[in-house]
């Protein structure tokens, strides 16, 4: 047999469905099995209650990605193996990674007091996450437009040059990735 469609790397959120594709050709028609980190993957063919289904095409469908604080049964490196009595074919490796966004910010912004006309800097480091979270800022719950020439956002820093009285307010840093969003503790600019 030969593999005609190989699985691809995937990043997926906990609880979401996903599919690892695999298609094989051969005479006689090969059977397909999946292995994760070298260990055979149990599917609905082994246990009807399984959250993993072996589709007729040979693809592996996850009804929902199972992922705990410690137990991570779905995360790992997968291959599909096509077999018939003439031999076997092994697909390329595909990694299944589970997206993550923790709650706790590595660095919350802190209150800043600044004189009018002076620059102000607010700093934030988003929670740990995978993919690595990006950030944006909100002032008084409204997203800040960083296209304004006095405002620049670089890394975790919000820089306001030539501050005005109207810049005073509550600033929140928002960390975001495919999992969702997390708000930092607010910081007051006075």
């Amino acid at each position: 047999p030969r593999i005609v469609e190989h699985p691809s790397d995937v990043i997926v959120s906990k609880g979401e469905p996903t599919t690892l594709n695999c298609k094989a050709e051969g005479r006689p028609t090969p059977t397909i099995e999946w292995y994760k980190d070298g260990e055979r993957v149990e599917t609905d063919k082994d246990d009807p209650r399984s959250h993993r289904m072996l589709l007729p095409s040979g693809s592996l469908f996850f009804l929902r990605i199972v992922h705990g604080r410690r137990s991570k049964p779905d995360e790992g490196s997968y291959v599909c193996v096509a077999r018939n009595y003439l031999g076997e074919a092994v697909s390329r490796n595909a990694s299944l990674e589970v997206a993550l966004l923790r709650d706790d910010f590595r660095q919350n912004p802190t209150d800043v007091v600044v004189a009018a006309g002076e620059p102000a800097i607010l700093e934030c480091q988003p929670p740990r996450g995978h993919p690595e979270p990006t950030i944006y800022w909100k002032k008084d719950k409204v997203r800040i437009d960083d296209k304004e020439e006095r405002i620049s956002i670089r890394g975790g820093k919000l820089m306001i040059s030539n501050t005005r009285k109207s810049d005073a307010g509550m600033y929140t840093c928002v960390g975001t990735n495919m999992v969702g969003e997390r708000d930092s503790d607010p910081a007051e600019l006075t």
């Epitope: 994760k36 980190d37 260990e39 055979r40 993957v41 149990e42 082994d46 246990d47 199972v66 992922h67 705990g68 604080r69 410690r70 137990s71 991570k72 049964p73 779905d74 790992g76």
Partner: antibody, heavy 118, light 105 residues
Framework: EVQLVQSGAEVKKPGASVKVSCKAS????????MHWVRQAPGQGLEWMGW????????EFPQKFQGRVTMTRDTSITTAYMDLSRLRSDDTAVYYC???????????WGQGTMVTVSS | DIVMTQSPSSLSASVGDRVTITCRAS??????LNWYQQKPGKAPKLLIY???SLQSGVPSRFSGSGSGTDFTLTISSLQPEDFATYYC???????FGGGTKVEIK
Amino acid sequence: EVQLVQSGAEVKKPGASVKVSCKASGYTFTGYYMHWVRQAPGQGLEWMGWINPKNGDTEFPQKFQGRVTMTRDTSITTAYMDLSRLRSDDTAVYYCARESGDDAFDIWGQGTMVTVSS
Amino acid sequence: DIVMTQSPSSLSASVGDRVTITCRASQSISSYLNWYQQKPGKAPKLLIYAASSLQSGVPSRFSGSGSGTDFTLTISSLQPEDFATYYCQQSYSTSFGGGTKVEIK
């Protein structure tokens, strides 16, 4: 069928050691942490620690550190719990339990009665 | 260490009664709280995980609520097979409550 099957009852003398086994089947052994929980006669449940079958990492509460050892053999999908320097108050039913991806013990072994008596 | 305090330690009830068991954590555990049922001579059985999610195959008369430090297991209409001991367990760092024995009145 997903199940955990434990070794049989043991009778030990104070000061001896006991090794209880837990054979896992029907699921990917290395994907789920394995915990050990014990229950003295007429008492509640007491957590003893966990092992990550993927790499052998372990964690125990302070009470059991230095006296409990948890190991695994991935080739036969079996986890082991070894308790040394046994005392009479170690008399209990010992359970292995799989920690699910929902952070709960969804599958339990049938239990192994360990009696420590002189 | 996080200490889990369950109350009451025992209760008597009749078939059809609504039964409530509470569990309090010594510090916040978010929703990392599970409930188990144990019958004499048997291993515990998972009923509720993550404070309020019903484990597959468990009857809907069982429900869980709470977050932070205070949690509740409710049996809406007690059935003969529900007479057992119930344990809460926090999976933040792992420890069990002392158990609640539900007996026939």
